[in-house]
């Protein structure tokens, strides 16, 4: 009797279990009682990444420089092109269809993780003992200057945005 289910990498059509086309190939004709499934390779600008019965291959993604995109990995007949963003930019989504400039960390915040082509800058508040007085996409929080090691004393306390101000020790107290 005609099958109602087929093996892995097969599909059911007209009561026949037909072989799926392998990745990198598209379906030209279904199998029949007397013939195999016929498949053709995708053209150079196209791909199919699964065992399939698609009659058309998918176009490779275009990494549009006008959107700040560049090719990270060229597509093959079995894989799509992977785009990434140009220096100073990162993807707005996982599919990386457009890019935006990296965020800068404001004064009082330092860079916890530098941005990549696919992820934005991660900032963190400068903890006690550290400061950042610049807006930057690269600089971490810096430790306050240690006045003691310079044989100086703190004249003005540091904040998360400013370093301590050191000064000479008061000689009257000596």
């Amino acid at each position: 009797e005609p099958p109602t289910a087929c093996r892995e990498k097969q599909y059911l059509i007209n009561s026949q279990c037909c072989s799926l086309c392998q990745p990198g190939q598209k379906l030209v004709s279904d199998c029949t009682e007397f013939t195999e499934t016929e498949c053709l390779p995708c053209s150079e600008s196209e791909f199919l990444d699964t065992w399939n019965r698609e009659t058309r291959c998918h176009q490779h993604k275009y990494c549009d420089p006008n959107l700040g995109l560049q090719v990270q990995q060229k597509g093959t007949s079995e894989t799509d092109t992977i785009c990434t963003c140009e220096e100073g930019l990162h993807c707005t989504s996982e599919s990386c269809e457009s890019c935006v400039p990296h965020r800068s960390c404001l004064p009082g915040f330092g860079v916890k993780q530098i941005a990549t082509g696919v992820s934005d800058t991660i900032c963190e508040p400068c903890p006690v003992g550290f400061f950042s007085n610049v807006s930057s996409a690269f600089e971490k929080c810096r430790p306050w200057t240690s006045c003691e090691t310079k044989d100086l004393v703190v004249q003005q306390a540091g904040t998360n945005k400013t370093d301590v101000v050191c000064g000479p020790q008061d000689r009257q107290r000596a």
Epitope: S29, T32, F34, T35, E36
Partner: antibody, heavy 112, light 112 residues
Framework: EVQLQESGPGLVKPSETLSLTCTVS?????????WNWIRQPPGKGLEWMGY???????NYNPSLKSRVTISRDTSKNQFSLKLSSVTAADTAVYYC?????WGQGTTVTVSS | DAVMTQTPLSLSVTPGQPASISCRSS???????????LNWYLQKPGQSPQLLIY???NRFSGVPDRFSGSGSGTDFTLKISRVEAEDVGVYYC?????????FGQGTKLEIK
Amino acid sequence: EVQLQESGPGLVKPSETLSLTCTVSGYSISSNYYWNWIRQPPGKGLEWMGYIRYDGSNNYNPSLKSRVTISRDTSKNQFSLKLSSVTAADTAVYYCARLDYWGQGTTVTVSS
Amino acid sequence: DAVMTQTPLSLSVTPGQPASISCRSSQSLENTNGNTFLNWYLQKPGQSPQLLIYRVSNRFSGVPDRFSGSGSGTDFTLKISRVEAEDVGVYYCLQVTHVPFTFGQGTKLEIK
């Protein structure tokens, strides 16, 4: 229901070309399948002559050398057989077939 | 070419009794995908061949379940579990794995 019907002259002179047409109904010959010509000499077995595929490409039985040509007319949903330089040995019932469905056959006699 | 050899060439069977026909190929009919394209046909007197079995063991639509096919590689068998009067005719195996397609020489089934 798929149906095939052969047509053509029943008598052909030696050294001439035998021409037969198969008209298909119930299925488009350009959709899928291989469309075959098969013959059966009187009192003998079946011999595959060749096919034309749904995409128009061909395959022929090497035993018929280069005498056989199968073509098609998709607008009429027909495919045709030409067999050149015929001899008495080409006298047979000629069938067109999709292999699951067959025509009823047409008898061709080669005689002067 | 794949030469198809059928045995026996004729058999006479009492109605209700089983019958078995063998078809042997000179080369394996299994293709690279693991599929085997071997058909069985019955040609009743004065008629076109009719498909019984395709891909070794699949009954064509409308074929009674007393007909079954089996085998692999080079050896194939058609079995009729209980022969009926309407089963008389010539049985052919046909391989369509390799070009040229080739038929067995036929097995004539008669009723005792």
